[in-house]
């Protein structure tokens, strides 16, 4: 039978080394055996490159393409092939479709005056455009109470957040995770970092009375 694309490729770039395209076929497909995504930078002399897609689900394919350190002018021509049959053709400008890398190494440390210090690492090296463009969202949730959660927007430069222990329930176990966004690139949010968990042992002041 004929091979058809149900949802055409949607692509995002981490704006440093990788672009990822995902699409959905109209029926379960062995992506790596049946399909190829070719990509070529619209730049004089550039070569045509081929990406072998992998299955994310039965009919969903994903392709990770190594790219050079992206610049705003870069535009790629993309062609999705099933053998000799061209299924889809389009263009992709990484600077217009940025999905930042996931922040790393989220840790929680007790700090002075009953505060918790949450720290994580900026996923970009200092020389990359995005290093100084990231803002973060930190989600803090009570492991035993789904209603007890807080969201903090970190819009200053440093990848840190100070959290008053008193804003959390005493004796409860909390988990935090962080994601990043690049405002000037109108990016999507990054994936959430892995969660880190800690016990909030703050003792409310009333108990001292």
């Amino acid at each position: 039978g004929s091979v058809k694309v149900l949802h055409e490729p949607s692509c995002f770039s981490d704006y440093i080394s990788t672009s990822v395209c995902q699409w959905k076929m109209d029926h379960p497909t062995n992506c790596s055996a049946e399909l190829r995504l070719s990509y070529q930078l619209d730049f004089m002399g550039s070569e045509n490159h081929t990406c072998v897609p992998e299955n994310r689900e039965d009919s969903v394919c994903v392709c990770s393409m190594p790219i050079d350190d992206a610049v705003e002018a870069d535009v790629y021509q993309l062609d999705l092939w099933a053998g000799q049959q061209l299924l889809w053709s389009g263009s992709f400008q990484p600077s217009k479709h940025v999905k930042p890398r996931t922040p790393g190494n989220l840790t929680v440390h007790p700090n002075i005056s009953h505060t918790w210090l949450l720290m994580w690492t900026n996923p970009y090296p200092t020389e990359n455009h995005l290093h100084s463009e990231l803002t973060y969202m930190v989600n803090v949730s009570n492991d035993n109470d789904p209603e007890d959660f807080k969201v903090y927007n970190v819009t200053y430069m440093g990848p840190t957040l100070r959290l008053a222990a008193s804003t959390l329930k005493s004796g409860a176990s909390y988990s935090a995770r962080v994601r990043a966004w690049a405002q000037t690139y109108n990016s999507t949010w990054s994936d959430w970092s892995p969660s880190t968990t800690w016990l909030n042992y703050y003792e409310p002041w009333e108990q001292h009375l």
Epitope: L41, F43, M44, G45, S46, E47, N48, D68, V71, E72
Partner: antibody, heavy 125, light 112 residues
């Protein structure tokens, strides 16, 4: 040492054909785009054509489009320029030159960093 | 197509002086910050051209530091300081950004 040696230049009548060759050595030929540039007697330099490292993409000056064909044989480290329907205004010294490194996603540019000695093509009746 | 305009078309300089050649393009040759696709070439009498400067300011291998390139966007300059008799020849700028590649008309440098 990088070397480019052109050959194939000759006296040919208008409407005739000629094939120029450029044999390369001293660098990884397949990794680089190659370019042909010509120079009419007493005139300036004129870009003619470019081919990327794999041979999969070619570019031409408007003056030669449809008449000239650039190609390469990476196994023989050789660049070619097939010239058909030649005209008097095609009379020139033809140089081959090493252009950008194309094995990277975005070609790395060093200008035309090495040139051959040139071969003379004369189109006259 | 991008048009390249070189000035002056001829230049006479005494040894030890500085020579400056200008090249202007009809469109920006900046692909990204720091990447201006403008080259300078020298063709000495009876020889093949040789590369001097690429990407606007980078010296080709073996080129003395007396040769320097500057500029961005559409305006570029080649400066030759402490000019020597050996620098005589025709200097060309060329845009390497997009097809068709194009050379300037050339500047003939004569040493007095």
């Amino acid at each position: 040492e990088v070397q480019l040696v052109e050959s194939g230049g000759d006296l040919v009548k208008p409407g005739g054909s000629l094939r120029l060759s450029c044999v390369a050595s001293g660098f990884t030929f397949r990794d680089y785009a190659m370019t042909w540039v010509r120079q009419a007697p007493g005139k300036g330099l004129q870009w003619v054509s470019l081919i990327n490292g794999s041979g999969g993409k070619t570019y031409y000056a408007d003056a030669v489009k449809g008449r000239f064909t650039i190609s390469r044989d990476n196994a023989k480290n050789t660049l070619y320029l097939q010239m058909n329907s030649l005209r008097a205004e095609d009379t020139a010294v033809y140089y081959c030159a090493v252009d950008r490194l194309t094995k990277t996603i975005r070609p790395q540019y060093y200008g035309l960093w090495h040139w051959g000695q040139g071969t003379l093509v004369t189109v006259s009746s | 197509d991008i048009v390249m305009t070189q000035t002056p078309l001829s230049l006479s300089v005494s040894p030890g002086e500085t020579a400056s050649i200008s090249c202007r393009s009809s469109q920006s040759l900046t692909y990204s910050i720091g990447y201006n696709y403008l080259d300078w070439y020298l063709q000495k009498p009876g020889q093949s051209p040789q590369g001097l400067i690429y990407l606007g300011h980078k010296r080709a291998s073996g080129v003395p530091d007396r040769f320097s390139g500057s500029g961005s966007g559409t305006d570029f300059t080649l400066r030759i300081s402490r000019v020597e008799a050996n620098d005589t020849g025709v200097y060309y700028c060329m845009q390497g950004l997009q097809s068709p590649l194009l050379f300037g008309q050339g500047t003939k440098l004569e040493i007095k």
